[in-house]
């Protein structure tokens, strides 16, 4: 009996320009001897239904069809003919199949495949135009794929030293996409120095696919206003 | 900083187990085999087989079948190497070694070794 | 098993001078296009080091002093200009079959 078992949940989730493998696990009644087996790797797009051939090992002979995609001989040996693909890109993304043969018998699996981009995050404050005690922070997040993503604003005062999410005043513009297909986007938030307590921490919350936990960066509201020269406009804050 | 620490020097008698410990780090575990290599004083390498942390697939050198076992903790990056029926001429030092295996085969970091005495 | 010999078994260098040591196996290591020869030193007291994969290709952080050739069955790893750390014992191993074996070792010493 020859079987295949690809990743448990039927998807895999890798990082973008990441050096990826692909499972697909053998399961033969005897040991496999791989110069008489075959191995083939395809792969179909989100975009297109149409399936492409990434990989094939045969015998004595193996071929890429995709720059640098590797089947391991030496792990083919133990049952183990999972697919590395270095520096995956975001259009690779799609379903994988593993097609094994051991004439004349034959298995096969397949696995969903994403690929994802962690955002990048920084602070801003933008002064241009803003009235006096008026300040306006700006919370840059960029290069994150899929699109979809989530953007709080949270306060933690001394009195209240749990985090308080902000509803009011707060901003997010459009998401806009980059040439290499990743987004950004920006939220703003406005705030009057002369209504909030000294020593506030504000934050602002990212939450991607992407990432394990939310990304987080902050800012102090001090006694004196913020006035930030030109070159400081565009500084991250701790 | 890739590192494989082995766990410490064993003196064993004829007849029992060895189980020597290769604790990696500074890479992801499942990227690459684990090598197990032994040398007897004053003796050169002797390769005894290697295990795939991805799937727990293993290869043995057929000298040391039914004798040698090799698994791996993935959870704590941990690969052990378990020796039975111990003979006097297993006194070697065992070294565990991280195997590439996409790109060539070879052995490119090892650990420090563990030195194996059986003796009655 | 593939049987791979060394030779010689051991020599005597003076530093700067060069060094070459052969390695013959008993049945090719080629698969592919590719020849899976690998070359290591063992210095003393010391678990063994990669110096070249794949017959020819310099690991990481290795001098260019030290290069690989050969294809088939018969291999070579030379040293252009040898140093007193140079010294150990150098292994030729081949790992397109199992067991994967190695050489008998050569020692290499400064005179």
């Known amino acids: 009996d020859l079987k295949v078992e690809m990743m448990a949940g039927g998807t895999q989730i890798t990082p973008l320009n990441d050096n990826v493998t692909i499972f697909c696990n053998i399961f033969y009644s005897q040991p496999l001897n791989i110069t008489s087996m075959g191995i083939t790797w395809f792969w179909k797009s989100l975009t297109f239904d149409k399936e492409v051939k990434v990989f094939e090992f045969f015998g004595d002979h193996q071929e890429a069809f995709r720059p640098g995609a590797i089947v391991s001989p030496w792990r083919l040996k133990s049952g183990d003919a999972s697919l590395r693909l270095p520096g995956i890109q975001l259009e690779e993304a799609g379903e994988y199949r593993c097609e094994v043969v051991v004439t004349p018998l034959k298995a096969q699996g397949t696995v969903q495949l994403e690929v994802v981009a962690s955002p990048a995050s920084r602070l801003l404050l933008d002064q241009v135009g803003m009235k006096e005690n008026e300040d306006k922070y700006m919370c840059e997040s960029s290069g994150f794929y899929p699109e979809a993503i989530n953007i709080t604003w949270e306060k933690q005062t001394q009195k209240f030293p749990h985090p308080i999410e902000i509803s009011e005043d707060v901003i997010t513009g459009p998401t806009i996409k980059n040439m290499d297909g990743t987004f950004n986007v920006t939220s703003c938030l406005k705030l009057n120095s002369s209504q909030e307590d000294p020593g506030t921490v504000y934050q602002c919350v990212v939450r991607h696919a992407s990432l394990h936990t939310p990304l987080r960066s902050n800012f102090t509201l001090t006694a004196a206003r913020h006035s930030l020269s030109e070159t400081e406009k565009t500084d991250n804050f701790s | 900083e890739v590192q494989l620490v082995q766990s410490g020097a064993e003196v064993k008698k004829p007849g029992a187990s060895v189980k020597v410990s290769c604790k990696a780090s500074g890479y992801t575990f499942t990227d690459y085999n684990m090598d197990w290599v032994r040398q007897a004083p004053g003796q050169g390498l002797e390769w005894i087989g290697d295990i795939n942390p991805n799937n727990g697939g293993t290869l043995y050198n057929q000298k040391f079948r039914g004798r040698v076992t090799l698994t791996v903790d993935k959870s704590i990056s941990t690969a052990y190497m378990e020796l039975s029926r111990l003979r006097s001429d297993d006194t070697a030092v065992y070294y565990c070694a991280r195997s590439e295996v996409f790109y060539g085969n070879y052995a490119d970091y090892w650990g420090q070794g563990t030195t194996v005495t059986v003796s009655s | 098993d593939i049987v791979l010999t060394q030779t010689p078994l051991s020599l005597s260098v003076t530093p700067g001078q060069p060094a070459s040591i052969s390695c013959k196996a008993s049945q090719s290591v080629d698969y592919d296009g590719d020849s899976y020869m690998n070359w290591y030193l063992q210095k003393p007291g010391q678990p063994p080091q990669l110096l070249i994969y794949?017959?020819?290709t310099l690991h990481s952080g290795i001098p260019d002093r030290f290069s690989g050739s050969g294809s088939g069955t018969d291999f070579t790893l030379k040293i252009s200009r040898v140093e007193a750390e140079d010294v150990g014992v150098y292994y030729c191993?081949?790992?397109?079959?199992?067991?994967?074996?190695f050489g008998q070792g050569t020692k290499l010493e400064i005179k």
């Open positions: 794949a017959a020819s």
């Open positions: 191993q081949q790992s397109k079959e199992d067991p994967r074996t």
